[in-house]
């Protein structure tokens, strides 16, 4: 989870008109029995606000203390506010929990932007709109933070769903999902459907809106259309994947594929933007600018600093290109592509001065820590984190925002040779994973 613009996200359920839903192709042979089905109690269990994160309700302690927790596939600590803070309406009060156990250890977590520190302990944790289980999990009680909590975001903690290798203070601290799987019979898989609003929400709407679903222990087939395509998890630290090709409106960026994964490519629900390595970002922006050249936008827009606005309902989606990322497939020399629309990479924001307009920020940005497939990507897709089979699945989300002309897509197979060469090998130093920078 990478703060670089790395914090949180947005909300609102805006599904396609029924007539535009794609027919499902079955792909039973790639599924494990018992993994698919209905998880009604978990559907719509996420909420969020634009750019501020998707959160799930959790309870900690005995008696249970209810908190909203940011769902973050880019980090591995379960950490909650445990002291008063101007941006927190509530916080975890360890002294009120009869089941809290002190681990006698401090922890410090710095992101690119934002930091927190606290004290480690364990307590009983459950997810009311999740599996009907209670587990004893490690909890970092956040006692001090800087630029971490977000005013008005409505979440009080963070659920790091990645692997132990990037847990702080070290990999001996078991992450929540590992504890959940170890202590229950829940399969080692979860899936996320993040539903972008597609339009700016005022505060009332934002608080009432549904943000999506976190399905723990399986796949809910009502949340996607078409088939699921899987890419291998390259290494179990972040959810690292390999991008083998990038296209803007079907035009190949024609870069050495190592550049796309320099120094890694990760799937991170805790990051708002699609973040690209410097060279890739520059090439992509050049191509997007060229494709949308019928309108001229200020440089600040492409840097994510300035809004662009159109009269309500007149956003010229058609002038903006689609972005396709080709991901390594499960079969040798086979890849598949995921395609997002401008409805995903132009992030709706409310501009108080011109509330009658529809305003957007460009949500593709530059990274010095590799490609980060943040909410901008994930809001187009149902994303399956199949930890048991070391793979990540993508299918078109049943709630993604689109128009009558184009839809997000997951398509394949494509023949792509030498995909292994696209992965970047990070030089091993003691500090290679020390700074968890987010954006």
């Amino acid at each position: 989870t990478h703060l670089g613009i790395r914090l949180p996200l947005r909300s609102g359920l805006a599904g396609p008109p029924l007539g535009l839903r794609l027919p499902r192709e079955t792909d039973e042979e790639s599924e494990e029995p018992g993994r698919r089905g209905s998880f009604v109690e978990m559907v719509d269990n996420l909420r969020g606000k634009s750019g501020q994160g998707y959160y799930v309700e959790m309870t900690v302690g005995s008696p249970p203390q209810t908190l909203n927790i940011l769902v973050d596939t880019g980090s591995s600590n379960f950490a909650v506010g445990a002291a008063p803070h101007p941006f927190l309406h509530r916080y975890y009060q360890r002294q009120l929990s009869s089941t809290y156990r002190d681990l006698r250890k401090g922890v410090y977590v710095p992101y690119t932007q934002g930091k927190w520190e606290g004290e480690l302990g364990t307590d009983l944790v459950s997810i009311p709109h999740g599996p009907n289980v209670t587990v004893r999990a490690n909890i970092a009680a956040i006692t001090e933070s800087d630029k971490f909590f977000i005013n008005g975001s409505n979440w009080e903690g963070i659920l790091g769903l990645a692997y132990a290798e990037i847990a702080r203070p070290d990999d001996s601290l078991e992450p929540f999902f590992d504890s959940l799987v170890k202590q229950t019979h829940i399969p080692n898989i979860f899936s996320l459907q993040l539903c972008g609003a597609g339009f700016p929400l005022n505060q009332t709407e934002a608080l009432a809106s549904v943000g999506g679903s976190m399905i723990i222990g399986g796949i809910d087939h009502s949340l996607y259309t078409g088939r699921l395509w899987y890419t291998p998890i390259r290494r179990e630290w972040y959810y690292e994947v390999i991008i083998v090709r990038v296209e803007i409106n079907g035009q190949d960026l024609k870069m050495d594929c190592k550049e796309y994964n320099y120094d890694k490519s990760i799937v991170d629900s805790g990051t708002t933007n699609l973040r690209l390595p410097k060279k890739v970002f520059e090439a992509a922006v050049k191509s997007i600018k060229a494709a949308s050249s019928t309108e001229k936008f200020p440089d600040g827009f492409w840097l994510g600093e300035q809004l662009v606005c159109w009269q309500a309902g007149t956003t010229p989606w058609n002038i903006f290109p689609v972005i396709s990322l080709y991901l390594m497939g499960e079969v040798t020399n086979q890849s598949f592509r995921i395609t997002i629309l401008p409805q995903q990479y132009l992030r709706p924001v409310e501009d108080v001065a011109t509330s009658q307009d529809d305003c957007y920020k460009f949500a593709v940005s530059q990274s010095s820590t590799g490609t980060v497939m943040g909410a901008v990507i994930m809001e187009g897709f149902y994303v399956v984190f199949d930890r048991a089979r070391k793979r990540i699945g993508f299918a078109v989300s049943a709630c993604h925002v689109h128009d009558e002309f184009r839809t997000a897509a997951v398509e394949g197979p494509f023949v792509t040779a030498d995909m292994e060469d696209c992965g970047y090998n990070i030089p091993q130093t003691d500090e290679s994973t020390l700074m968890t920078g987010r954006a």
């Epitope: 410090y108 004290e119 006692t143 203070p169």
Partner: antibody, heavy 124, light 107 residues
Amino acid sequence: EVQLLESGGGLVQPGGSLRLSCAASGFTFSTYAMGWVRQAPGKGLEWVSATSGSGGSTYYADSVKGRFTISRDNSKNTLYLQMNSLRAEDTAVYYCAKGGSQWLYAPGSWFDPWGQGTLVTVSS
Amino acid sequence: EIVLTQSPATLSLSPGERATLSCRASQSVSSYLAWYQQKPGQAPRLLIYDASNRATGIPARFSGSGSGTDFTLTISSLEPEDFAVYYCVQRSNFPWTFGGGTKVEIK
């Protein structure tokens, strides 16, 4: 130049109270963790307490927990240690020390420099 | 609590000699360990932090190594001002603990 000046030490009876102060200068006090370390006469060093820059995070040694309270007044650039229910084994030179950052638990955020210390003697 | 055992308790050496001080932890402290120097009548000063990083202004003759449970402070060539007591300290677990110290004295 960083300067730390401890005061408030002295002779106190067992069960009594004392408040130590540490006046800091030469740096932006509110952006650094601060701590107290003690050294009994002729003995080694013992961490007593520490606090993060804003006072959100605090640390206490088991031997003083519930009896000692660390606090800071960032407007006065002063660190305090309120010591209650004093015991003979609390007799020591108490040093005030500046952290390496605002954070208490960050790697690299060790305590340096230290003041010259103030002697606390608990005796009847 | 984590016990830090320093050895030897006393090290008698001449100026110009190499000093090797050991600090062993009763359980892993990762690299959350530092070394302080204290001279008689003075406050301690930080030499090495996070096991191997020299603090600001500390001469290159001081170096630290180790991680987990075994740590070493090395003074490559002793100067007259280096004769002092050296303490290791860990901040991995509560309570934060110091070793008992190693006194480096002139032979």
